[in-house]
Every structure is written in structure tokens, then in C-alpha cells.
């Protein structure tokens, strides 16, 4: 049914879906708090910009009565649900922001006529990618195989002097919902990096990883995984490990690494941690006590959110352009708008862009260093430690096929 | 440890002028936005002023605007509210917090404005 945006006449609207199934276990009041902040920021600047407007955001509870798993996996029929309420109560905002989980995301952006924008904290997967009206605000699927791609191919750094070309991959189901769809990307037959890689096996038991620690048979010297290093220390514990073998630890919404105190853990010497760069939001254990690293940068998209929709709304405002048009639904990609951390970019598809770090353990001080970073914007990797103290042989990272070359 | 002490508090006539002060203190202050808030007795909480972490940005609840100018120190981890034409609703507890999670609060410094 034609559903009513209450978006015109000075007063505009954002629809905030307050889903029970979360990419992230996060309270809704610590995203209603979130939202609140971003819509106390979007007014100044509107008022500054001389828009004399009324922007205000509606919170949409589900009942959860039927979809109580907490995770995502239900989140499909309660999106649906939800979307139903806004179609019953005739009444919808220029923007919906809330779909985090990708099987609702996937299932929502299907099932409705998109003349408005959707915005999502999380939809990692690759069936939420070139969708035409929806962003994404934290770091989806594409971006990491990208990296990982570019990365195995790097052959002409001080640290990697061989192309790579194989990978085990562990994923045995138990993995948070970003690290699933992550995961779940890189094992896709028709993924890119499925596609760029000659071999690639995927590891779905603890058995399975624990012995390709030593196997003297193995066809890769390189094992993804994701999560952090208390999850890979209860898989590998103090096993001992080939000194070939390298582990990518995919922990991409953690900053714990960057904090002064932080030592390595011993198993993490022949670990390659993945993350995010803190940019200006790094924050101390001690600091945080509601909220974890993953779930302020969850919180956090949501404020960006609004952020993202005061940016273009006054874009449009000042430009004399209708908002509830075609146009505003698909501007939403393509340009950088100011974040609450700093300046925060989309690409041509409207997924956020980030710069990634790729951190080692220096055997010297037994703290994280950082390799080398990433930008994803430009699908180009930064060396930052041109000598460094490796476990590995020669300190360079070894050929991913043992007995291939020297190493 | 991550510490807000605010001061600056009193009691001052209607017309009247206060500098509030909030020092911070283990964590990084020049990362993160600042905003002052405040308790009126039986009142719940309410925004005053929040200021970018480079003092970029500058934003005011309606009822003050004019009137109270929020600042910041980076090099000395210092964040202010200075507040002229005080009125007796300005009456209440001033917090500093720090960041939209709002997770680290001060004491507070109290307030109070009557002839």
C-alpha cells in the first residue's frame, strides 16, 4: 500500500527500526542515545547552515513476541514484520535507518518499493552489495576480500617477497554475525577471492585446525580466521605450531590492540591481526564500561546514520531539491560527509570506506606493531614497518606452500 | 583511570556570570566530543552545550543559547562553560561528560542562581 512519508513542510522524519534481532547484543537504549545525539548535532548544523527545519527520528519496536532469538537468525520475518507496521500506521520517514542483520536487510530492500534510503549498521554480506538506496556504515564483506585479494597477490614488500595463492579458512559456525558473513564470503565458490585463489579449503572443526598447525602435508601455510585473540586462544591454546604457518586473525571492530598497556599474548606470534584504525575514537579498557569496542562502533554507525541524512538532507534543502524523489534515495553514495570520530567516506555503492591494519606481534617488545595499512577507498596497501621484528624466518613472511622457494 | 572533575560552581544573583571547568583526565580528551549537562532539583537530565573534539563545532540547547559559551583546551585536557546572564532556572548540578556513550560522568558542581 502507498505509504505517506512525513518528510515535507520544514519537518523531516527518520524512521528508526529497533530491531530484537541485532548484528550486535546491544541495548536499545544505548542506540535510542546514540540516535538522540546525532539528531542534537544534525540540528545545530542545520540551524548554522540557516535551515530552520524540525528533524526528529521515530523509534519502531517490534513486539518480539515470535522473533525472539536475539541474533539474526529470525531477523528476516521480523523486518518484514516491522515494515508491515509502518505500511498499517501509513506513515514512514524520509530515511530507515536500523536493518543490521543481512538476512532482513536482503529481505526488506526486496520487498519494498525503495523510493527512500536505507541505512544499516552492519548487512555484512554479499548479498547486501550494489544495492541502489541502501549504505552501509561499517566495513561489509567486499572490503575485506579486497584487501585479502591485493594482500596475497603483494609480492614486492621487504616482509612479502611471494605472491600467494592458497588459504585454509576456519569457520566452524559458532562466529559473531560480522565475522560470519566475512567468512561466509571468503568460502563462496563465485567470490572473488575464491576466484583469485588456486586453493582454498575451509576448516569447519577444531580437530581440523588444530592439526594443520604441524601437518607436514598441508597444502596451505596460511589459515584465516576471525575473531579475537581469546577466541584463537581457545582453539589453538599453547599448541605448538610450524614456523611456517601463518594465521590471519580477522578483528576488524577492535581497538584493544592500539592501548599503550597491551602485550601480546605468547600464541599471538605468529599471528597477522586484521583491524580497523582507531581514528579518533580510541578508547581505553577502563574507559567504556557500557559499551565494548565492537558495539560503540555499532552505536556509532547508527549515529553516523543521522549524521549521513542531516549532511544530505541539507544539501538538498539548500539546493531547493524535493527530498521524498528518486534522487535523494540514490544520493546517498559517492562523497564524505562529517562524522562524529572525523570525516567518514562512501563509495560509488554507498559502503563505508576505512583504512585497515594489519598488525603483527614484534618478537623484541612483544607488542602489536602495525605492517602495514590499507585503504579501502583506493584498494591500496601502505607498508608502515619496512624492517620488521617477525617470528618468521629472515623476519619476511614465508611462502604459502612450504618447500616452494626458499624460506 | 579515566577521571571528569568539574568546579567552578556557586551561588550567584540573577544577571550574573559563572566559568565552569571540567578536567579530564586518562584518556585521550583531544579525540573525543564534550558536553556539558545539567540536573535541575527534581528535574531529569538536560544537554547544555557539546563542542567537537577540535572545537569545530559548537552546539547550545535553545534556553541558553547567547548566553553560555562552551570551550575547550586540548593541551591541558580542560573543557569550560562560561555563563553570563544567569537565570534562576540555570539553577542545577553541571556535568561533563564525554562522548555519546556517556560513559564516563564527573561529580558534578553545583549551581545556584537567586537574589
Known amino acids: 500500500s502507498q505509504v505517506s512519508q512525513n518528510c515535507h513542510n520544514g519537518s523531516y522524519e527518520i524512521s528508526v527500526l529497533m530491531m530484537g534481532n541485532s548484528a550486535f547484543a546491544e541495548p536499545l537504549k544505548n542506540l535510542e542515545d546514540a540516535v538522540n545525539e546525532g539528531l542534537e548535532i544534525v540540528r545545530g548544523r542545520l540551524q548554522n547552515a540557516g535551515l530552520n527545519v524540525t528533524v526528529n527520528a521515530t523509534f519502531m519496536y517490534s513486539d518480539g513476541l515470535i522473533h525472539n532469538s536475539g541474533d539474526c537468525r529470525s531477523s528476516t520475518c521480523e523486518g518484514l514484520d516491522l515494515l508491515r507496521k509502518i505500511s498499517n500506521a501509513q506513515r514512514m520517514g524520509c530515511v530507515l535507518i536500523g536493518p543490521s542483520c543481512t538476512y532482513s536487510t536482503f529481505q526488506m530492500y526486496l520487498d519494498t518499493e525503495l523510493s527512500y534510503p536505507m541505512i544499516s549498521a552492519g548487512s555484512f554480506g554479499l548479498s547486501c552489495d550494489y544495492k541502489e538506496t541502501l549504505t552501509r556504515l561499517m566495513s561489509p564483506a567486499r572490503k575485506l576480500m579486497y584487501f585479502l585479494v591485493n594482500f596475497w597477490k603483494t609480492n614486492d614488500l621487504p616482509f612479502k617477497t611471494y605472491s600467494w595463492s592458497t588459504s585454509y579458512v576456519y569457520k566452524n559456525g559458532t562466529e559473531t554475525e560480522d565475522c560470519f558473513w566475512y567468512l561466509n564470503a571468503l568460502e563462496a565458490s563465485v567470490s572473488y577471492f575464491s576466484h583469485e585463489l588456486g586453493f582454498k579449503v575451509v576448516l569447519r572443526q577444531d580437530k581440523e585446525f588444530q592439526d594443520i598447525l604441524m601437518d607436514h602435508n598441508r597444502k596451505s601455510n596460511v589459515i584465516i580466521m576471525c575473531g579475537g585473540p581469546e577466541f584463537l586462544y581457545k582453539l589453538k591454546g599453547d599448541r605448538a605450531v610450524a614456523e611456517d604457518i601463518v594465521i590471519i586473525l580477522v578483528d576488524l571492530f577492535n581497538d584493544q590492540y592500539f592501548e599503550d598497556n597491551v602485550t601480546a599474548p605468547d600464541y599471538m606470534k605468529n599471528v597477522l591481526v586484521l583491524t580497523l584504525s582507531p581514528g579518533n575514537s580510541l578508547l581505553n579498557s577502563s574507559f567504556s564500561r557500557n559499551l565494548s569496542p565492537t558495539k560503540r562502533d555499532f552505536a556509532l554507525a547508527y549515529l553516523n546514520g543521522i549524521l549521513l541524512f542531516g549532511h544530505m538532507l541539507k544539501i538538498f534543502l539548500e539546493n531547493g531539491e524535493n527530498i521524498t524523489t528518486p534522487k535523494f534515495a540514490h544520493a546517498f553514495r559517492n562523497l564524505t560527509f562529517e562524522g562524529y570520530d572525523g570525516p567518514v567516506t562512501l563509495d560509488d555503492w554507498g559502503d563505508v570506506d576505512s583504512t585497515m591494519v594489519l598488525l603483527y606481534t614484534s618478537v623484541d617488545t612483544k607488542k602489536y606493531k602495525v605492517l602495514l595499512t590499507y585503504d579501502t577507498h583506493v584498494n591500496k596497501t601502505y607498508p608502515v614497518d619496512m624492517s620488521p621484528t617477525f617470528t618468521w624466518k629472515n623476519s619476511k613472511l614465508p611462502n604459502d606452500i612450504t618447500g616452494r622457494g626458499p624460506q | 583511570e579515566v577521571q571528569l572533575v568539574e568546579s567552578g560552581g556557586g551561588l550567584v544573583q540573577p544577571g550574573g556570570s559563572l566559568r565552569l571547568s571540567c578536567a579530564a583526565s586518562?584518556?585521550?580528551?583531544?579525540?573525543?566530543?564534550m558536553t556539558w549537562v545539567r540536573q535541575a532539583p527534581g528535574r531529569g537530565l538536560e544537554w547544555v552545550a557539546k563542542i567537537r573534539y577540535d572545537g569545530g563545532e559548537k552546539y547550545y540547547v535553545d534556553s541558553v543559547k547567547g548566553r553560555f559559551t562552551i570551550s575547550r583546551d586540548n593541551a591541558k585536557n580542560s573543557l569550560y562553560l562560561q555563563m553570563n546572564s544567569l537565570r534562576a532556572e540555570d539553577t542545577a548540578v553541571y556535568y561533563c561528560a564525554t562522548d555519546f556513550t556517556r560513559d564516563v560522568w564527573g561529580q558534578g558542581t553545583t549551581v545556584t542562581v537567586s537574589s
Open positions: 586518562g584518556f585521550t580528551f583531544s579525540r573525543y566530543w
